[in-house]
């Protein structure tokens, strides 16, 4: 009686059940009553990830320079190439097909995130008592200068954009 | 109990043809396909053609395409192997063989054939 | 077409001793070798199938192993009607190729 279904890592054709090819090799020619699944390995700049009976291999993945990509990691018959940004620029996509340059943080806003190759600068208001006074990909929200720690007053109060200022007690005569 | 049994071998002269016939039971016959090995004498083992259970699919190494055809009566439960155009080279003992789970399981006894003038 | 190497050509031991053959192939074929005994006079049998799985009714002493391009065929203590010759045929690819043989012989 032919077989309806087959194992793991099998397929049916001409009902009869042939193996897959592994990770790494395509599919050459089917099983026969005689003779296994005929499999070659995938060429150079070649892969094939999952058990399969593809004809052909897919092309490793191009990292373009031109998109400000470089390899993260090289693929391998068995692997794509993995794609990642420039330093400075992060991935426009999970696919990372192409790159855009890391967001900057406002005066007024803080990092709460540095960027990477894969997720942009995420940025954060300054709350009471920090400023940021610079556009920035990196720098946090400092904290207000503490003018009592330097037996200094307040002269002028900060504000989410500019530190306090600070200026020398009135003595009493 | 499975049962291989080869006909029809004999002395031939070269370029004359010859059928070879294959009896088989104790197993249904539509089931398997079937191949025809050779073993000249005192020599290895050579595999000459193979056909699919249900008889639409054949195989032949190069030296033997064109020149033998394998069939099969499945009514009859008999492999039948056609050679045209004999040489010297093909002088020996023929097996026919049933294949199960991809390997040569059972074999027949074999018929010699001999080409010689 | 993959060629099919055996060696030795022929064994000399005694019974009791332990005999390995070897089988080699030309590329990789994965476990796709079957292997044969052939006593004189006798047609092949099936000794081992998928390399390295047994065949029911083939006493235990009979074992293969091996993957890709390199195959052994061992019987761990031959007794008098092991003497023979023994093939490996592969079913990787078309053509199918046997290999010339390995005669086991009394020392």
């Known amino acids: 009686e032919p077989p309806t279904a087959c194992r793991e890592k099998q397929y049916l054709i001409n009902s009869q059940c042939c193996s897959l090819c592994q990770p790494g090799q395509k599919l050459v020619s089917d099983c026969t009553e005689f003779t296994e699944t005929e499999c070659l390995p995938c060429g150079e700049s070649e892969f094939l990830d999952t058990w399969n009976r593809e004809t052909h291999c897919h092309q490793h993945k191009y990292c373009d320079p031109n998109l400000g990509l470089r390899v993260q990691q090289k693929g391998t018959s068995e692997t794509d190439t993995i794609c990642t940004c420039e330093e400075g620029w992060h991935c426009t996509s999970e696919a990372c097909e192409s790159c855009v340059l890391h967001r900057s943080c406002s005066p007024g806003f803080g990092v709460k995130q540095i960027a990477t190759g894969v997720s942009d600068t995420i940025c954060e208001p300054c709350p009471v008592g920090f400023f940021s006074n610079v556009s920035s990909a990196f720098e946090k929200c400092h904290p207000w200068t503490s003018c009592e720690t330097k037996d200094l007053v307040v002269q002028q109060a900060g504000t989410n954009k500019t530190d306090v200022v600070c200026g020398p007690q009135d003595r009493l005569r | 109990e499975v049962q291989l049994v080869e006909s029809g071998g004999g002395v031939v002269q070269p370029g004359r043809s010859l059928r070879l016939s294959c009896a088989a039971s104790?197993?249904?016959?539509?089931?398997?396909?079937m191949s025809w090995v050779r073993q000249a004498p005192g020599k290895g083992l050579e595999w000459v053609a193979s056909?699919?259970?249900?008889?639409?699919?054949?195989y032949y190494p190069d030296n033997v395409k064109g020149r033998c055809t394998i069939s099969r009566d499945n009514s009859k439960n008999t492999l039948y192997l056609q050679m045209n155009s004999l040489r010297a080279e093909d002088t020996a003992v023929y097996y026919c063989?049933?294949?199960?789970?991809?390997?040569?399981?059972?074999w027949g006894q074999g018929t010699l054939v001999t080409v010689s003038s | 077409e993959i060629v099919l190497t055996q060696s030795p050509a022929t064994l000399s031991l005694s019974p009791g001793e332990r005999a390995t053959l070897s089988c080699r192939a030309s590329?990789?074929?994965?476990?796709?070798l079957h292997w044969y005994q052939q006593k004189p006079g006798q047609s092949p049998r099936l000794l081992i199938y998928?390399?390295?799985q047994s065949i029911s009714g083939i006493p235990a002493r009979f074992s293969g192993s091996g993957s890709g391009t390199d195959f052994t065929l061992t019987i761990s203590s031959l007794e008098p009607e092991d003497f023979a010759v023994y093939f490996c045929q592969q079913f990787n690819s078309w053509p199918l190729t046997f290999g010339q043989g390995t005669k086991v012989e009394i020392k």
């Open positions: 104790g197993f249904t016959f539509s089931n398997y396909g």
């Open positions: 590329q990789s074929i994965r476990d796709n």
């Open positions: 056909i699919s259970s249900g008889g639409d699919d054949t």
């Open positions: 063989t049933r294949a199960g789970g991809k390997a040569m399981d059972y």
């Open positions: 998928y390399a390295s």
